[in-house]
């Protein structure tokens, strides 16, 4: 089948990194500089993606594969193939049209991207708030008040996180 197809269509023999050149009796010409073809049998090459501005090159373009971009520090990728770079914010903030804004009371964001989300409503699960929420952290729900009646085993809250490399005082 391959041989038959090749006899019918000389372009099918052109490998990735080349194109079937109409100007040269359909011989396989290398893709011009700064272009690529990722599959065989193509009549055209495509222009390599340019990673410029807030984009930086993660992988250089080759004759057989497009360049891949990521974002410069302070920005993060959005969209398929990092089609956009969006500004980072601090934890406890979200990006608005006017820039980074602190999360409103009752909401939090524990990442440098995305939106502020409401704290968990512990009472919906019949639980109580064990650790209050902040702009950066969700509340921690504990056992329901009924579970803390005399005789019930109490829950020890987790010890506060310490800086790595520091031993307890």
């Amino acid at each position: 089948f391959e041989r038959t197809r090749s006899l019918q269509d000389p372009c099918s023999n052109c490998p990735a990194g080349t194109f079937c050149d109409n100007n040269r009796n359909q011989i396989c010409s290398p893709c011009p500089p700064n272009s690529f073809s990722s599959a065989g049998g193509q009549r055209t090459c495509d222009i390599c993606r340019q990673c410029k501005g807030v984009f930086r090159t993660r992988k250089e373009c080759s004759s057989t594969s497009n360049a891949e971009c990521d974002c410069t520090p302070g920005f993060h990728c959005l969209g398929a193939g990092c089609s956009m770079c969006e500004q980072d914010c601090k934890q406890g903030q979200e990006l608005t049209k006017k820039g980074c804004k602190d999360c409103c009371f009752g909401t939090f964001n524990d990442q440098k991207r995305g939106i502020c989300r409401p704290w968990t409503n512990c009472s919906l699960d019949g639980k109580s708030v064990l650790v209050n929420g902040t702009k950066e952290r969700d509340v921690v729900c504990g056992p329901s008040p009924a579970d803390l009646s005399p005789g019930a085993s109490s829950v020890t809250p987790p010890a506060p996180a310490r800086e790595p490399g520091h031993s307890p005082q």
Epitope: F19, D21, N22, N23, S29, C31, R43, T44, C45
Partner: antibody, heavy 118, light 108 residues
Framework: EVQLLESGGGLVQPGESLRLSCKAF????????INWVRQAPGKCLEWVGY????????TFNDKFKDRFTLSVDKSKSTAYLQMNSLRAEDTAVYYC???????????WGQGTLVTVSS | NIQMTQSPSSLSASVGDRVTITCRAS??????LAWYQQKPGKAPKLLIY???TRATGVPSRFSGSGSGTDFTLTISSLQPEDFATYYC??????????FGCGTKLEIK
Amino acid sequence: EVQLLESGGGLVQPGESLRLSCKAFGYTFTNHHINWVRQAPGKCLEWVGYINPYNDYTTFNDKFKDRFTLSVDKSKSTAYLQMNSLRAEDTAVYYCARTWGHWYFDLWGQGTLVTVSS
Amino acid sequence: NIQMTQSPSSLSASVGDRVTITCRASQSVSSNLAWYQQKPGKAPKLLIYDSSTRATGVPSRFSGSGSGTDFTLTISSLQPEDFATYYCQQYNNWPPWTFGCGTKLEIK
């Protein structure tokens, strides 16, 4: 006959959108890129961008990539230029033009006039 | 972006004259340069590509030369149908591909 035929031009108000079409005849549509080139009154020719109908890959002039998008309908051998948030300075004749492995334009449509005015 | 500068911007000549139009690139474009002819109300038509290769069906009186930054289009003996505007275009460097702003060839 090998040709490209544009349509969809007309008068629109600033801020509005418009979609131009470019229908290919007489050749294998997926073998060539479709480019869009515009010519404002008394101005130079200006390349907008291209789409490869074979794989839907697009590349734009940076000047246009935020407001313009390119697409194709292979079953209709037709390419589209979607223009959003149009401005008075987008007033021009818009041509579709064909390229392939080399980046000169070997076939042009007849052009369609887009006028942006209030 | 690479700037393409054409000179002269307009030119008057007579049928039978030899005419030369120049195009200069702001940086080298190797031999990746095309010339187009455009008549009023019509689309541009490819004349020359790769600096010196005539497109299919283009009369032999049209010729192109040059490489790097300096290019010329020559019409050896003007015919009445040659009065039009001529554009150069570079396709060497990253998009955007850029055009000269044209040379209008008028009848003297």
